[in-house]
Interface confidence: low
Amino acid sequence: LIIGFGISGRHSITVTTVASAGNIGEDGILSCTFEPDIKLSDIVIQWLKEGVLGLVHEFKEGKDELSEQDEMFRGRTAVFADQVIVGNASLRLKNVQLTDAGTYKCYIITSKGKGNANLEYKTGAFSMPEVNVDYNASSETLRCEAPRWFPQPTVVWASQVDQGANFSEVSNTSFELNSENVTMKVVSVLYNVTINNTYSCMIENDIAKATGDIKVTESEIKRRSHLQLLNSKAS
């Protein structure tokens, strides 16, 4: 969490941002909140990005003002116009690109004063893994698949029964480039699995960590997946 204050003494307002990550090809949110004002027409929101000549987005007098918007963001940004009056300056970024990563500033002007806060935005690809029993294999084998990751993640297997065991010798992981030539499909195979055990396939890069669990018993198979972004810090 980053909290910024205006620089002009008593004419300052608190602006708060939260570092976040964008999943390339999908829509993302750059979070920013501020002390609300009673009049929408008195609120100016500017989103800026370090190293970019034009603005990322500007909202003033109750509507978007995009005459100074940089071409790399054209047609891809929007604020939640109905929530600005209650202090939400968050930016929706459509079709997140790898190049959208960087440091952003949420700059706010209201009748109470000015304030700003920076936000670190990471971009990459991350997806939920699914673990299945590979019935085609000659021995008891589990197959963990996740369709989109970038940068290349690490894959680690763990087991509830054999806690702390190193499965690198009995697993094989491959990365297959997807058609857009950026993200990759992750496939990891674990051999010699035992019944009545819970196995976890953990995929992690510097943006996200995802886990796929599978519990195999004589009578049933239970699956569970979980994904966590690693850099959600507020400012």
Epitope: K49, G51, L53, L55, E68, D70, M72, K105, Y107
Partner: antibody, heavy 121, light 107 residues
Amino acid sequence: EVQLLESGGGLVQPGGSLRLSCAASGFTFSSYAMSWVRQAPGKGLEWVSAISGSGGSTYYADSVKGRFTISRDNSKNTLFLHMNSLRAEDTAVYYCARDIQWFGESVFDYWGQGTLVTVSS
Amino acid sequence: DIQMTQSPSTLSASVGDRVTITCRASQSISSWLAWYQQKPGKAPKLLIYKASSLESGVPSRFSGNGSGTEFTLTISSLQPDDLATYYCQYYNSYSRTFGQGTKVEIK
């Protein structure tokens, strides 16, 4: 140490063309916007053109729009200014400058030594 | 377009004097103003940005002030090395505009 070294200036006839280059070193060139600024003999500074770090966005002063083109080659750490349809009033020392983009707080923190362009018949 | 007007055009002062240069914008520019120093035959050098922030390595005798339409550059104690022309500059996302310059001479 940041260094900017302009070249390509010289004498050219009205209506002619010239290409200025600026070789950059001492910093990650592709991370910075760059600008050209000129100064006519005995006169003040005039901003000419700017380009984003990636080269995707370019901006021009009204006085050169349609005649000058700014570009960059990030693999060679070089900035260019292609000048066409040159006029006598384009005579100036042309400086390349690193254009610090810190969220709209854009300033020129490093400058080259300049290259003189003279447009005369 | 926003116009920047500096005054005076030329200023003559003695070593140790307090010197003030004014820059006026034709409309409000918030704090988007920088000051540069250009010594004879040299490239300009950044002194102040965002109206009052001192660039690193610049002597503390230089200071900037103002917001909106009126800005000042002050040299608290003029030194022989300060002989130069000083320019103010407005900047926004896509344009840069310089004032016409103020030449500072040493008496």
